[in-house]
């Protein structure tokens, strides 16, 4: 049951885990106020070294910016101090606390606002745009298989309600610039591109602005194209095995293939004392191959029961698809039962079924 997760891993850049959305605070300060942000250690335990970050950039202490392990002070705040602040563990970069700070012309009311994605005019404060959920905007790289759909979002707020526009590679981006067009949802602060193609690769920037200022976020889109290839076999499989006479053995072979693979298990044999034919091709016997009701999962395991000395030798997992073949081999050594204890002491690699 791995589809969603795997697709997500393929499709997204790695990110530092952040706090739960409920842990984010929306704070409004008046121009000239002292911005004070406090971040106590989670669970009251030791905090370790921390770093304070504004809009993704580490804050440098100054006469106006006072940085402590659990507290940040910005004196004589101005519009430029609006933004997303976070306190992170220095070593892991894990976000411990997250604040969305707005500095307005009016004296601060002390009221926090809900972090909704929809724009709302509060009718009270006026101020520059700010991201409503800044902790969700850390990820900037999106890699997507061709023919799928991409959505970029920049949910923001401000008073008056800001406008949003989109750039591609620094230039105005409109529907006529791509086959299939684009879908804009201003109330959802989103840009949607259906059925992406390689020419959609690039940098997409949302610009959110009102008369008090503007903020922007740039995302990078990579569109992945698949080139067909022969099956890929997991390294180290099948693995060499040592078994005691009469025990059971399993060889495993993990196959990755775009095209439907055909899997076979072969055992190398000798014919008239020779392991290879005149053309250099090894002599083999087919032990297991696809049948009407055989699943790929079943074919990825070769089970040998009650092994005899004749079972010793080289085994090969052969996987083919419409592009080509791949194979990995492993050896089985069969020991007489009385050697079991001695061998186990010496090598620690004996399996007694």
């Amino acid at each position: 049951e791995s589809l969603g997760t795997e697709q997500r891993v393929v499709g997204r850049a790695a990110e530092v885990p952040g706090p739960e959305p409920g842990q984010q605070e929306q704070l409004v300060f008046g121009s000239g106020d002292a911005v004070e942000l406090s971040c106590p250690p989670p669970g009251g335990g030791p905090m370790g070294p921390t770093v304070w970050v504004k809009d993704g950039t580490g804050l440098v202490p100054s006469e106006r910016v006072l940085v402590g392990p659990q507290r940040l002070q910005v004196l004589n705040a101005s519009h430029e101090d609006s933004g997303a602040y976070s306190c992170r563990q220095r070593l892991t970069q894990r976000v411990l606390c997250h604040f969305s700070v707005r500095v307005t012309d009016a004296p601060s009311s002390g009221d926090d606002e809900d972090g909704e994605d929809e724009a709302e005019d509060t009718g009270v404060d006026t101020g520059a745009p700010y991201w409503t959920r800044p902790e969700r905007m850390d990820k900037k790289l999106l890699a997507v298989p061709a023919a799928n759909t991409v959505r970029f979002r920049c949910p923001a707020a401000g008073n008056p309600t800001p406008s949003i526009s989109w750039l591609k590679n620094g230039r105005e981006f409109r529907g006529e610039h791509r086959i299939g067009g684009i879908k804009l949802r201003h109330q959802q602060w989103s840009l949607v591109m259906e059925s992406v193609v390689p020419s959609d690769r690039g940098n997409y920037t949302c610009v959110v602005e009102n008369k008090f200022g503007s903020i922007r976020q740039t995302y990078t889109l990579d569109v992945l194209e698949r080139s067909p290839h022969r099956p890929i076999l997991q390294a180290g499989l099948p693995a060499n095995q040592t078994a005691v006479l009469g025990s059971d053995v399993e060889f495993h072979c993990k196959v990755y293939s775009d095209a439907q693979p055909h899997i076979q298990w072969l055992k190398h044999v000798e014919v008239n004392g020779s392991k290879v034919g005149p053309d250099g091709t090894p002599y083999v016997t087919v032990l297991k191959t696809a049948g009407a009701n055989t699943t790929d999962k079943e074919l990825e395991v070769l089970s040998l029961h009650n092994v005899t000395f004749e079972d010793a030798g080289e085994y090969t997992c052969l996987a083919g698809n419409s592009i080509g073949f791949s194979h990995h081999s492993a050896w089985l050594v069969v020991l007489p039962a009385e050697e079991e204890l001695v061998e186990a002491d010496e090598a620690g690699s004996v399996y007694a079924g």
């Epitope: 791995s2 997500r8 997204r12 905007m137 759909t149 979002r153 059925s195 698949r226």
Partner: antibody
Amino acid sequence: EVQLVESGGGLVQPGGSLRLSCAASGFTFTSTGISWVRQAPGKGLEWVGRIYPTNGSTNYADSVKGRFTISADTSKNTAYLQMNSLRAEDTAVYYCARTYGIYDLYVDYTEYVMDYWGQGTLVTVSS
Amino acid sequence: DIQMTQSPSSLSASVGDRVTITCRASQDVSTAVAWYQQKPGKAPKLLIYSASFLYSGVPSRFSGSGSGTDFTLTISSLQPEDFATYYCQQSYTTPPTFGQGTKVEIK
């Protein structure tokens, strides 16, 4: 033009097996997924499972897990639904549908949308 | 699994009517909801994805809205070809699940 054509349906006894095929054309088979959805006579839609041929990853509904297997052959642009240990309650019209993802950095899930559907093939499990 | 509950299960309407179908999820599914139309003996057709995005080629009289647990499909002016059964479906988690359907019949 995107097209999906199912085949392989028919009458089968309980405990029997059947393999359905879904031949696709008109789109990049390795970039999107294929879902199987079934509809019992006079009933609603029930998702059966899906495959992303790109990496072969599959998901199944609990009701068919361990009995049904979805696979794909990208060289033939065809997806398959192998149905084993069939039961009377598996009687339905089986549809395959092209499935694409909506990738969105802002959220922690990938939404999957089934946009093109085949005409369906009827599977009847009866003794 | 997430349950999707549609209402009403059936409705009668006339050509030109405004029709609204609702769908409620048993838990928050964000905006990961699609709507499908199915006519007897035919395969379903995608109308709306991501709760409010009209799929290409679908007439603009169809619209979708909602987020979280409550979703709505609206047909602004019912046309003769719109008499069919409509299904909502969540794709927030695996397995995706469908509503039981709403049959729109001619009054």
